[in-house]
Amino acid sequence: SAGAGSHCQKTSLRVNFEDIGWDSWIIAPKEYEAYECKGGCFFPLADDVTPTKHAIVQTLVHLKFPTKVGKACCVPTKLSPISVLYKDDMGVPTLKYHYEGMSVAECGCR
Amino acid sequence: SAGAGSHCQKTSLRVNFEDIGWDSWIIAPKEYEAYECKGGCFFPLADDVTPTKHAIVQTLVHLKFPTKVGKACCVPTKLSPISVLYKDDMGVPTLKYHYEGMSVAECGCR
């Protein structure tokens, strides 16, 4: 698994809806692959972490003043939807085919 | 200044181009307000940090398994341009009105 010493990357994160209390309204799936963005945004920022100009600037300032300014952060830069089956107010199962922003597609330094 | 104990917010970050070695090509300004996103993404995530569904999920998983999964991260979610006067390849001073992505407009939890 990618720790703080490794570079920013997408790692596995299986989420069980019961663990987060969403099983009260999500019928299926019981769990899904959410992924997590883990690792550091170290100088020099590689192209694969698609840094913004601000992230590059902040990284350079952090190099100069590490106690004053933090590093850029490894976060999801593109998310994917999943399909979920949920209970409506009347307990009727209904499908949301395109439930946005639930799974990480790409990570980057921001 | 917003520390790790405070909520995700935009804080001041004055960047001097000489400090980051960009004074070799940026003529003016000498420094600018880049801002920085600082603070934690704590449960419950407020609307003003515009959390994605993934950020909400990750926050809930972090609550349940704090050592296994990190919190969402406070990062720039919207950037603003600045105007810069820079030297082109031939050393000619050139004005770029919209040098994109240089300053934080908004912070959020991702």
């Epitope: 299926a28 799936p29 019981k30 899904y32 692959e33 994917s80 939807p81 999943i82 399909s83 089956l85 409506d88 107010d89 009347m90 009727v92 199962p93 209904t94 499908l95 949301k96 085919y97 395109h98 | -």
Partner: antibody
């Protein structure tokens, strides 16, 4: 009991327009994401488009073949879903179903022919 | 040509076990979201199951599995009333909605 009842199908000439309705009951219609799916004679299922609930912004998405010609709307006060079909083509001939993904109506036949 | 590929036909005798495959041929479609519909002659499609969820009224003779880029529907103890079309469906991220396989016509012989 969940019920979805489509109406408004019929024969129309190429270039013409038609509005389909889907009356819903037995579930919280205002919270549901509703889709239209069609089935050409002797063919498979084809997604037409979807409208999200108002609480999820009420946005619509459409399949490429109908984009710009078809419009999905909803009236939550009447528990009714609509499909406005303009500039109809012969290839739009199909049975049109409204669906929550879990529940489907019986379908209404649209025939586009000169 | 559908991005979810199914065999056009399948058959078996009463009591037999039949499987219908569904192969994903597009990177925009995650096998995770694939589910199945049944359409009996002259009727509307009906959800067979979605992940672990099986609607009331759907026989436990139907089961599904996923492996790699393929999903399978298995029917055990085949009965004459199972005759009809079976469609796999997935979430096409680019299309922002469901995409259906071409359908498999199941014939119960004898």
């Amino acid at each position: 009991e969940v019920q979805l009842v489509e109406s408004g199908g019929g024969l129309v000439k190429p270039g013409g327009s038609l509005r389909l309705s889907c009356a819903a009951s037995g579930f919280t219609f205002s919270n549901a994401w509703m889709s239209w799916v069609r089935q050409a004679p002797g063919k498979g299922l084809e997604w037409v488009g979807r409208i999200k609930s108002k609480t999820d912004s009420g946005t619509t998405d459409y399949a490429a073949p109908v984009e710009g010609r078809f419009t999905i709307s909803r009236d939550d006060s009447k528990n009714t879903l609509y499909l406005q079909m303009n500039s109809l083509k012969t290839e739009d001939t199909a049975v049109y179903y409204c669906t929550t993904g879990t529940y489907w109506g019986q379908g209404t036949l649209v025939t586009v022919s000169s | 040509q559908s991005v979810l590929t199914q065999p056009p036909s399948a058959s078996g005798t009463p009591g037999q076990r039949v499987t219908i495959s569904c192969s994903v041929t597009n990177p925009d479609i995650d096998i995770f979201n694939v589910h199945w519909y049944q359409q009996l002659p002259g009727t509307a499609p009906k959800l067979l199951f979605f992940h672990e969820y099986r609607p009331s009224g759907v026989s436990d003779r139907f089961s599904g599995s996923k492996s790699g880029t393929s999903a399978s529907l298995a029917i055990v103890g085949l009965q004459s009333e199972d005759e009809g079309y079976y469609y796999c469906a997935g979430l096409d991220e680019a299309m922002r909605g469901p995409v259906f396989g071409g359908g498999t016509k199941l014939t119960v012989l004898g």
